[in-house]
């Protein structure tokens, strides 16, 4: 048996930020579960990582370098992504394992969500007035 | 080829303590969680600790928890558990596995043996 997730099908990250929420088919409650976010279409980077039971505070890593935290729904986790390069943009996968008590238990793959990182533009310098006609 | 490997096993007197490891090689160990599980003597297989992949996270089963500590060390690829105030009823084979739906991967196992 497989937990389902649902995630939004694209986000733009218009101030290099993003909240990405992950929706999931399981109540977490009373549960030690590990939700983690991973980066490009093979997963291959782990951007996130949210441990979290209901009897202590959640415990948020990225050993990728990313900037992140999290927050905790019943059935949610929300990623919350700070200072975000354009580079970064790609297609990003949430994932759920139920860690305690057995028997592990994780999601089927999401379809995931395309993350549009937009650069900061700086405000262009007002033109200068021509001159002035007597 | 996936590999496990245990190693540490042997006979301890009740209260005494044993660190085991698990050698792992033919996959990349970094990327997965890991767990010990046991079998006693006439018994069905006990779960007994995982960590999961960055080494972040530990649980326990109740019977070994405050007694037993797992570990990892992901640039030699080896999982590690700590045993101490050992009793009789820890007298198991001792595995190490992938810890997953699957357990895809699963050492050999290592006798442990607690008696006085």
């Known amino acids: 048996n497989k937990i389902l997730v649902k995630q939004s099908p694209m986000l733009v990250a218009y101030d290099n930020a993003v909240n990405l929420s992950c929706k999931y088919s399981y109540n977490l409650f009373s549960r030690e579960f590990r939700a983690s976010l991973h980066k490009g279409l093979d997963s291959a980077v782990e951007v996130c990582v949210v441990y979290g039971n209901y009897s202590q505070q959640l415990q948020v890593y990225s050993k990728t370098g990313f900037n992140c935290d999290g927050k905790l729904g019943n059935e949610s986790v929300t990623f919350y992504l700070q200072n975000l390069y354009v580079n970064q943009t790609d297609i990003y996968f949430c994932k759920i394992e139920v860690m305690y008590p057995p028997p592990y238990l994780d999601n089927e793959k999401s379809n995931g969500t395309i993350i549009h990182v937009k650069g900061k533009h700086l405000c262009p310098s007002p033109l200068f007035p021509g001159p002035s006609k007597p | 080829e996936v590999q496990l490997l245990e190693s540490g096993g042997g006979w301890v007197q009740p209260g005494g303590s044993l660190r085991l490891s698990c050698a792992a090689s033919?996959?990349?160990?970094?990327?997965?969680?890991m767990a010990w599980v046991r079998q006693a003597p006439g018994k069905g297989l006990e779960w007994v600790s995982v960590i999961d992949s960055l080494g972040l996270q530990a649980y326990y089963a109740d019977s070994v928890k405050g007694r037993f500590t797992i570990s990892r060390d992901n640039s030699k690829n080896t999982l590690y558990l700590q045993m101490n105030s050992m009793r009789a009823e820890d007298t198991a084979v001792y595995y190490c596995a992938e810890y997953s739906g699957a357990f895809d991967y699963w050492g050999q196992g290592t006798l442990v043996t607690v008696s006085s």
């Open positions: 033919g996959f990349t160990f970094s990327r997965y969680h």
